[in-house]
């Protein structure tokens, strides 16, 4: 059988290294050797490359080497496949070296900010040594912030006459570390160099970008003062490296600025004690270069009716996220504040919050929350400066079986009845939503019975027991992950009724 006709010929010119062609099929059933015929010097000269020996047989690739690699040039290539039965020739293909030239990557030697020019990095590089001197090179500059996985790209060209191998990358974030990598190719070529080694640079620091501001309103104290826990953090989009030297807070009752109080702190939280009126609170952060824009918060009067617009809320889990969605009756509300914290028996040690805009859902990566912990999630509607009634739900990112079963006791033991009561498992040991309880009971040497009740039931009366009989009993609490038995108890039914 004749060899297959060589097809899909693809050639690439590795500048000053070789000119390599590949083709298909890569493997033949019988031993096949290949001859690649070439014309070069604009058709004036010809030569061949061959896989004519056993070590290279069936390799669908051949390389032409210097000194006959001429550039610029047009090459003609034809591949012949030969086996014991005969020869098959490919179609003739034509290659303009400028269009298939691949050169070495450039080498970035500095990525620096330029004094006084904000949000810009100047990249300097060394043009690859193995690149045609006179050609215009096109470049792709890839860049990303150091903690991001997503690359952005910018394309540009440089004439050889420029000799100025620099590029000013603008519209960056202030005081942010960027990773840069660069590739290049002759302007006419379809083949890019590899990427250069990555280099890191940091944009100049500026005055702080801004703050996100929130509060927790606590119940009024006996003397009528209201504790308000203020909290703030760098605004979304602020530079990762940004550091504030401190924070200035000032606040006053609505329409009474001459009662302004000021506080300076280096913390990101501060407790205010306010009267029952409406208050306005302002916070700025500052560093050596200036102040951030002002973050503003209105604290409603104690007796103010807050609006309610969230009608329902659902929390669901995807493969790697917790997604909370809500429905609202107020289309004009497009900003929401989400709070989340662990539902523990003691004061929550960690309290988190985040603003959501132009969406009615909020997502968080599962790995940002602890498995087996119940989280309280509240969503507040925010309409301009007004904060509405929150809607709350609870969620686990991963449920497990309870760490302990219910503590059970037998009450009101009768001749044929007994009332079983059990305590709720402490929050820290539930490891999931308790969906039901199952009571297992068994007379001495008798058959085991069970009864399952809803999670809101903590007491159950067993009937139709046998008089004057010893029973063992335990209650199992179950989550979606499974159940855990409580301590086993024993009781004995009475022989006669006791009134």
């Amino acid at each position: 059988v004749l060899p297959a006709k060589p097809e899909n010929i693809s050639c690439i010119f590795y500048y000053e290294e070789n000119f390599t062609c590949t083709w298909s099929p890569e493997k033949e059933a019988s031993y096949t050797w290949y001859k690649v015929k070439r014309t070069y010097s604009y058709g004036y000269k010809s030569d061949i490359c061959s896989t004519d020996n056993s070590t290279r047989g069936n390799h669908a690739s051949c390389s032409f080497l210097p000194p006959t690699i001429t550039n610029p040039d047009n090459y003609t290539i034809q591949v012949e496949a030969q086996n014991a039965d005969g020869i098959m020739k490919s179609d003739i293909t034509y290659w303009n070296l400028d269009a298939i030239m691949k050169i070495e990557p450039p080498e970035i030697f500095s990525v620096k900010s330029v004094l006084g020019i904000k949000r810009m990095l100047q990249i300097k590089w060394i043009r690859p040594v193995l690149a045609p001197h006179s050609s215009t090179l096109k470049y792709t500059l890839r860049f990303r912030t150091i903690n991001s996985a997503y690359w952005m790209e910018v394309n540009f060209t440089k004439e050889d006459i420029d000799r100025d191998e620099t590029y000013n990358l603008t519209e960056l974030q202030a005081f942010t570390e960027y990773v840069m990598t660069l590739r290049c190719a002759p302007a006419e070529s379809m083949f890019w160099s590899g990427w250069s080694q990555e280099k890191v640079g940091t944009t100049e620091e500026e005055a702080p970008y801004g703050l996100d501001l929130w509060r927790v309103l606590k119940p009024a104290m006996v003397d009528g003062r209201r504790p308000v826990q203020l909290m703030w953090k760098k605004a979304t989009g602020a530079p990762v490296l940004e550091k504030a030297l401190g924070y200035n807070i000032w606040y006053f009752p609505e329409n009474n600025t001459n009662l302004t109080e000021t506080v300076n702190t280096t913390n990101q939280t501060h407790e205010l004690y306010l009267g029952g009126k409406t208050y306005w609170v302002y916070v700025v952060s500052y560093n050596s270069l200036g102040e951030s824009p002002v973050a503003t918060l209105r604290i409603p009067a104690l007796n103010e009716k807050t609006f309610q617009c969230i009608e329902a809320m659902q929390a669901c889990l995807t493969q790697d996220q917790l997604v909370v969605e809500w429905q609202s009756s107020a289309p004009e509300v497009d900003t929401w504040m989400v709070e989340w914290f662990p539902d523990v028996d003691s004061e929550p040690s960690s309290f988190s919050w985040e603003s959501v805009s132009q969406a009615r859902n909020w997502t968080i990566q599962k790995d940002e929350l602890k498995p087996l912990w119940c989280y309280n999630i509240s969503v507040y509607p925010v309409l301009r400066d007004r904060v509405g009634q929150p809607y709350s739900t609870q969620a686990y990112v991963q449920e497990g079986i309870p760490s302990a079963g219910p503590v059970t006791q037998a009450d009101s033991i009768g001749v044929k009845t007994v009332t079983i009561t059990w305590k709720e498992i402490p929050k820290s040991k539930r490891n999931g939503f308790i969906k039901n309880y199952t009571i297992f009971y068994q007379a001495e040497d008798g058959k085991e019975f069970s009864k399952t009740v809803n999670s809101n039931i903590l007491q159950y009366r067993l009937e139709s027991l046998t008089r004057r009989t010893s029973y063992s009993l335990q209650v199992m609490a179950s989550t979606n992950a499974g159940g855990t038995n409580g301590t086993k108890i024993n009781f004995k039914t009475l022989s006669i009724s006791v009134l």
Partner: antibody
Framework: EVQLVESGGDLVKPGGSLRLSCVAS????????MSWVRQAPGKGLQWVSG????????GYADAVKGRFTISRDNARNTVYLQMNSLRAEDTAVYYC????????????????????????WGQGTLVTVSS | EVVMIQTPLSLSVSPGEPASISCRAS???????LVWYLQKPGQSPQLLIY???SRATGVSDRFSGSGSGTDFTLRISRVEAEDVGVYYC?????????FGQGTKVEIK
């Protein structure tokens, strides 16, 4: 037997045209470049034009550039020389010659240098340009 | 174009004597692209030497070639009667390919 047979030579008036043909046999025609070489009466050899195996023109002598055109038909194993605007100084025996084969000169490994020469020649065809 | 100058233009040699023909190029030529041909009286030219020094199939070892750059030489160690004819050098390095003007070898 490897053979080249030229035809088409004739007596033609200045400014006239002529097409020479060279039929090849005994070898795989499309593996080889072909050339036309001429020899004026009592003079030396002059390379006229050449065509590579792929059908690309190798070039023309300065004296014939713009007037002569070389071509090949691999299906017919034939190379042609179209001669226009003929002049008295084009009078010569025109030889068809085969370029060296695409082999030889193994450099070691898989790459082969190509040495250039005309290894097979036809018997020639006479072109006379005269009024 | 590259001009090839042969010297001498004619050469009369006694049988058994050596002979030498020089070919000088107007610019450097790669040794791979320098060829010698012999045209015997009344015949088409035939290949003698290619790549400056490689003998063509069937060519006597009395013929040898050498040189590089712009100066190339063809030597016949012992001339025989069958060696008469015109010897041409040719370069392939640049277009157009060009021949020397020829050297006529005769037997004394």
């Amino acid at each position: 037997e490897v053979q080249l047979v030229e035809s088409g030579g004739d007596l033609v008036k200045p400014g006239g045209s002529l097409r020479l043909s060279c039929v090849a046999s005994g070898f795989t025609f499309d593996d080889y470049g072909m050339s036309w070489v001429r020899q004026a009466p009592g003079k030396g050899l002059q390379w006229v034009s050449g065509i590579n195996w792929a059908g690309g023109t190798i070039g023309y002598a300065d004296a014939v550039k713009g007037r002569f055109t070389i071509s090949r038909d691999n299906a017919r194993n034939t190379v042609y020389l179209q001669m226009n605007s003929l002049r008295a100084e084009d009078t010569a025996v025109y030889y068809c010659a085969r370029e060296s084969p695409l082999r030889l000169g193994d450099l070691g490994g898989d790459y082969f240098y190509y040495y250039y020469y005309l290894d097979v020649w036809g018997q020639g065809t006479l072109v006379t340009v005269s009024s | 174009e590259v001009v090839m100058i042969q010297t001498p233009l004619s050469l009369s040699v006694s049988p058994g004597e050596p002979a030498s023909i020089s070919c000088r190029a107007s610019q450097s030529v790669s040794s791979r692209y320098l060829v010698w041909y012999l045209q015997k009286p009344g015949q088409s030219p035939q290949l003698l030497i290619y790549g400056t020094s490689s003998r063509a199939t069937g060519v006597s070892d009395r013929f040898s070639g050498s040189g590089s750059g712009t100066d190339f030489t063809l030597r016949i160690s012992r001339v025989e009667a069958e060696d008469v004819g015109v010897y041409y050098c040719q370069q392939y390095d640049n277009s157009p390919r060009t021949f020397g003007q020829g050297t006529k070898v005769e037997i004394k």
